[in-house]
C-alpha cells in the first residue's frame, strides 16, 4: 500500500533569463528512494540515482544543474520553458510516486512564487 505523499514547490513563476529551483519532497513513507527522474512534459531532464548519482540529459546540460538535494535548477529560462515538470520517485517497496510543478516563465520583471501544496 502506498502511503506516501509528494510535496512540491507547486505552481511557480519566474522571469525570462533567470533561474528557478524545482523541488519535491516525499514524506509519510519509510520506502527507500532508489531513483528520482525529472521530466519536462515527455522529455527526460535528469536522473538522480541512489547509487550512481546524477545524470543530466545531454540536450539540457547547458541549462540544468543538479540540486539542491534531489531538486533541479533550471537556468537561462525562456518562455518556451513554460509548462509542466514532473518529479518521479522510484521507491522500494512502494513503487512510483509522481509530483507535478507548473512553471510560467514571464516576460515581465514581476514574478511571484506560488504556495506549496500537497499531491497525494
Amino acid at each position: 500500500m502506498m502511503t506516501g505523499t509528494i510535496e512540491t514547490t507547486g505552481n511557480i513563476s519566474a522571469e525570462k533569463g533567470g533561474s528557478i529551483i524545482l523541488q519535491c519532497h516525499l514524506s509519510s513513507t519509510t520506502a527507500q528512494v532508489t531513483q528520482v527522474n525529472w521530466e519536462q512534459q515527455d522529455q527526460l531532464l535528469a536522473i538522480c540515482n541512489a547509487d550512481l548519482g546524477w545524470h543530466i540529459s545531454p540536450s539540457f546540460k547547458d541549462r540544468v544543474a543538479p540540486g539542491p538535494g534531489l531538486g533541479l535548477t533550471l537556468q537561462s529560462l525562456t518562455v518556451n520553458d513554460t509548462g509542466e515538470y514532473f518529479c518521479i520517485y522510484h521507491t522500494y517497496p512502494d513503487g512510483t510516486y509522481t509530483g507535478r510543478i507548473f512553471l510560467e516563465v514571464l516576460e515581465s520583471s514581476v514574478a511571484e512564487h506560488g504556495a506549496r501544496f500537497q499531491i497525494p
Partner: nanobody, 125 residues
Framework: QVQLVESGGGVVQPGRSLRLSCAAS????????MGWFRQAPGKERESVAA????????YYADSVKGRFTISRDNSKNTLYLQMNSLRAEDTAVYYC??????????????????WGQGTLVTVSS
C-alpha cells in the same frame, strides 16, 4: 459530480477536418483544467491536448502539433478539439477529461478526476 459528454466524432477521409465538442455540467467549468485523450484499438490511452482553466496555457502531443487545436468556451461550458489534416493513425475513441481545480494544463491522465464516455473518430478512405 461533473458529467462530460463528447460529440462530433464520425467517419472522415484522410486530409479532412473534424471538430469534437465536450459539454460539461456544473457551474464551475471556468475553474476546470481540461484535456483530450484518445485510445486506438489495441493500444494504450494517450494524451492529445490539454488546456488550462482560463485558456492561457495549452499542451499538444508531438503527434498532433500543428494539426489539432484545443480551445474552450467557458460561457458555454464546452471544450473543443479542432482536428485538421487527419490521418489514418488518428483513428481512435476520443475522450475529454477534467479536473476540479488546478493551475496550468495537465497533460497526463493520472491527474484527471472526471471522464466522458468517448466519441469514435475513424479516418479512412
Amino acid at each position: 459530480q461533473v458529467q462530460l459528454v463528447e460529440s462530433g466524432g464520425g467517419v472522415v477521409q484522410p486530409g479532412r477536418s473534424l471538430r469534437l465538442s465536450c459539454a460539461a455540467s456544473g457551474n464551475s467549468f471556468s475553474s476546470y483544467p481540461m484535456g483530450w485523450f484518445r485510445q486506438a484499438p489495441g493500444k494504450e490511452r494517450e494524451s492529445v491536448a490539454a488546456i488550462s482553466s482560463d485558456g492561457r496555457f495549452s499542451y499538444y502531443a508531438d503527434s498532433v502539433k500543428g494539426r489539432f487545436t484545443i480551445s474552450r468556451d467557458n460561457s458555454k461550458n464546452t471544450l473543443y478539439l479542432q482536428m485538421n489534416s487527419l490521418r489514418a493513425e488518428d483513428t481512435a475513441v476520443y475522450y475529454c477529461a477534467c479536473r476540479d481545480s488546478g493551475s496550468g494544463y495537465y497533460s497526463r491522465a493520472q491527474w484527471y478526476d472526471y471522464w466522458g464516455q468517448g466519441t469514435l473518430v475513424t479516418v479512412s478512405s
